[in-house]
C-alpha cells in the first residue's frame, strides 16, 4: 500500500479484511489512462476479451469502465485504532458482467465474466498518489498492484515501499 | 487512542525559515498519509500537502511547492512540515492531520493534532 | 482546482433550532465530501466522511446529505455545544479543498 509500511507488514491486514456489505458506497463511470496518458482500452477477439494500453487517435473515444466503490475494515491489529481502520476498495468493469480481476499465478490482469457476489480476486484496494493518479493493489495479494508492462496490464509486486511511487502502477481516472 | 502532538510555538522573520513537527501515537504509523493543514488568523482552512510515512512520497499543493518541505522519521513516527523564506502572510496555525482512510484521501482528515502557531514578524 | 462554497457565512440560531448548512462544489466530487466542526483556538473534528456517515463518536443530531456537487449539513437539535465554525471539504481530487467556513451563533 501506497506509503504504507514496508509491504510484507501489511499482508495479513489485506486477507483478513472484510469488505463491509455487498453494495458499493458509490459507482462511476471513468475512462483508464496511465500515468503517461496512454489509454486502457477493451476489445472483443475471440468470444473474450483483450485488455490493451495504447495511445489513441486523435478524437478516437475512449472506453469507459464502471468503478465500484466498497467501504472495507482495515484490521485493528494493523491499524491500531480499532473499528475506525478504513480502507476502499473498487471493482472495475468495463461492459456488462465483466469484472478485471488479478490471476496471480500468471501475474496477469484479465476480463473474467462472473456473477455476484464477486471473488476476491476481483477487488482492488485503492490508493491516491501522486497528484491525482491512483493504484490499484490486489486484495489477494498485498504489495501487488495492477501495472503496465509491454502495452499490457500486468500483476507488478512492489518490492518495499520505496518503490511505490513508480510511473507503471500510477493510473489516471477521467469522467470526461 | 490516536494522537497527533504538535512542537511548540514559533516566531520567526521574514525570509527565514521554520520546522514544526508532529508525533504520532496509538496507531500503525506508517499506515496513514500524513496531511498539513494551514488556518491564517479568522481564516479558513488551506491544504498543504501530504506523506506517505512508509515510502516517504509526497504531495504537495501547488501553491506551496516551492517553498514547502514535508519529510518523515519513521523511528520516532514524526512527520515534519518545513516552509522557507517566511513572509508575513505565512503567520498561521499551522495543523497535521491523518487521513480517515488506509492509502485514500476521500474520506478526509479523522484525526488533528493541536496546532503549532507560527507568527512571521520583523 | 475544486472550489467549495458554503453557505450562510454565518447564523445565529437558538438552542433546539433545526440548523441547515449547505455546500456546494464546482464539479462532481460524488460522495467525497467531509464535515468538520471546529471551536475557537482549537483543532477542527471529524464530523462526517463520505457525506453521510457519521465518524465515531459523533452524536447522531449532526446528518449529513448530497451526492455530486451539492451537499447539507443538518443539526436537528442545536445544542450549547454545537456552537461553533464548521467546514465542509472535497476529497474527490488534490489539491484537497475546504469551503470558506460557516459560523453558527447563539441568538
Known amino acids: 500500500a501506497f506509503g504504507i509500511s514496508g509491504v510484507q507488514k501489511y499482508t495479513r491486514a489485506l486477507h483478513d479484511s472484510s469488505i463491509t456489505g455487498i453494495s458499493p458506497i458509490t459507482e462511476y463511470l471513468a475512462s483508464l489512462s496511465t500515468y503517461n496518458d496512454q489509454s486502457i482500452t477493451f476489445a472483443l477477439e475471440d468470444e473474450s476479451y483483450e485488455i490493451y494500453v495504447e495511445d489513441l487517435k486523435k478524437d478516437e473515444k475512449k472506453d469507459k469502465v464502471l468503478l465500484s466503490y466498497y467501504e472495507s475494515q482495515h484490521p485493528s491489529n494493523e491499524s491500531g485504532d480499532g473499528v475506525d481502520g478504513k480502507m476502499l476498495m473498487v471493482t472495475l468493469s468495463p461492459t456488462k458482467d465483466f469484472w478485471l480481476h488479478a490471476n496471480n499465478k500468471e501475474h496477469s490482469v484479465e476480463l473474467h465474466k462472473c456473477e455476484k457476489p464477486l471473488p476476491d480476486q476481483a477487488f482492488f484496494v485503492l490508493h491516491n498518489m501522486h497528484s491525482n493518479c491512483v493504484s490499484f493493489e490486489c486484495k489477494t495479494d498485498p504489495g501487488v498492484f495492477i501495472g503496465v508492462k509491454d502495452n499490457h496490464l500486468a500483476l507488478i509486486k512492489v518490492d518495499s515501499s520505496e518503490n511505490l511511487c513508480t510511473e507503471n502502477i500510477l493510473f489516471k481516472l477521467s469522467e470526461t | 487512542e490516536v494522537q497527533l502532538v504538535q512542537s511548540g510555538a514559533e516566531v520567526k522573520k521574514p525570509g527565514a525559515s521554520v520546522k514544526v513537527s508532529c508525533k504520532a501515537s496509538g496507531y500503525t504509523f506508517t499506515s496513514y498519509w500524513i496531511n498539513w493543514v494551514r488556518q491564517a488568523p479568522g481564516q479558513g482552512l488551506e491544504w498543504i500537502g501530504r506523506?506517505?510515512?512508509?515510502?516517504?512520497?509526497?504531495s504537495y499543493n501547488e501553491l506551496f511547492k516551492d517553498r514547502v518541505t514535508i519529510t518523515r522519521d519513521t523511528s520516532t513516527s514524526t512527520a515534519y512540515l518545513e516552509l522557507s523564506s517566511l513572509r508575513s502572510e505565512d503567520t498561521a496555525v499551522y495543523y497535521c492531520?491523518?487521513?480517515?482512510?488506509?492509502?485514500?484521501?476521500?474520506?478526509?482528515?479523522?484525526?488533528w493534532g493541536q496546532g503549532t502557531l507560527v507568527t512571521v514578524s520583523s | 482546482d475544486i472550489q467549495m462554497t458554503q453557505s450562510p457565512s454565518s447564523l445565529s440560531a437558538s438552542v433546539g433550532d433545526r440548523v441547515t448548512i449547505t455546500c456546494h462544489a464546482s464539479q462532481n466530487i460524488h460522495v467525497w465530501l467531509s464535515w468538520y466542526q471546529q471551536k475557537p483556538g482549537k483543532a477542527p473534528k471529524l464530523l462526517i466522511y463520505k457525506a453521510s456517515t457519521l465518524h465515531t463518536g459523533v452524536p447522531s443530531r449532526f446528518s449529513g446529505s448530497g451526492s455530486g456537487t451539492d451537499f447539507t449539513l443538518t443539526i436537528s437539535s442545536l445544542q450549547p455545544e454545537d456552537f461553533a465554525t464548521y467546514y465542509c471539504q472535497q476529497g474527490q481530487s488534490s489539491p484537497l479543498t475546504f469551503g470558506q467556513g460557516t459560523k453558527v451563533e447563539i441568538k
Open positions: 492531520a491523518r487521513e480517515f482512510y488506509y492509502g485514500s484521501f476521500y474520506g478526509g482528515f479523522a484525526y
Open positions: 506523506i506517505a510515512p512508509g515510502s516517504g512520497f509526497i
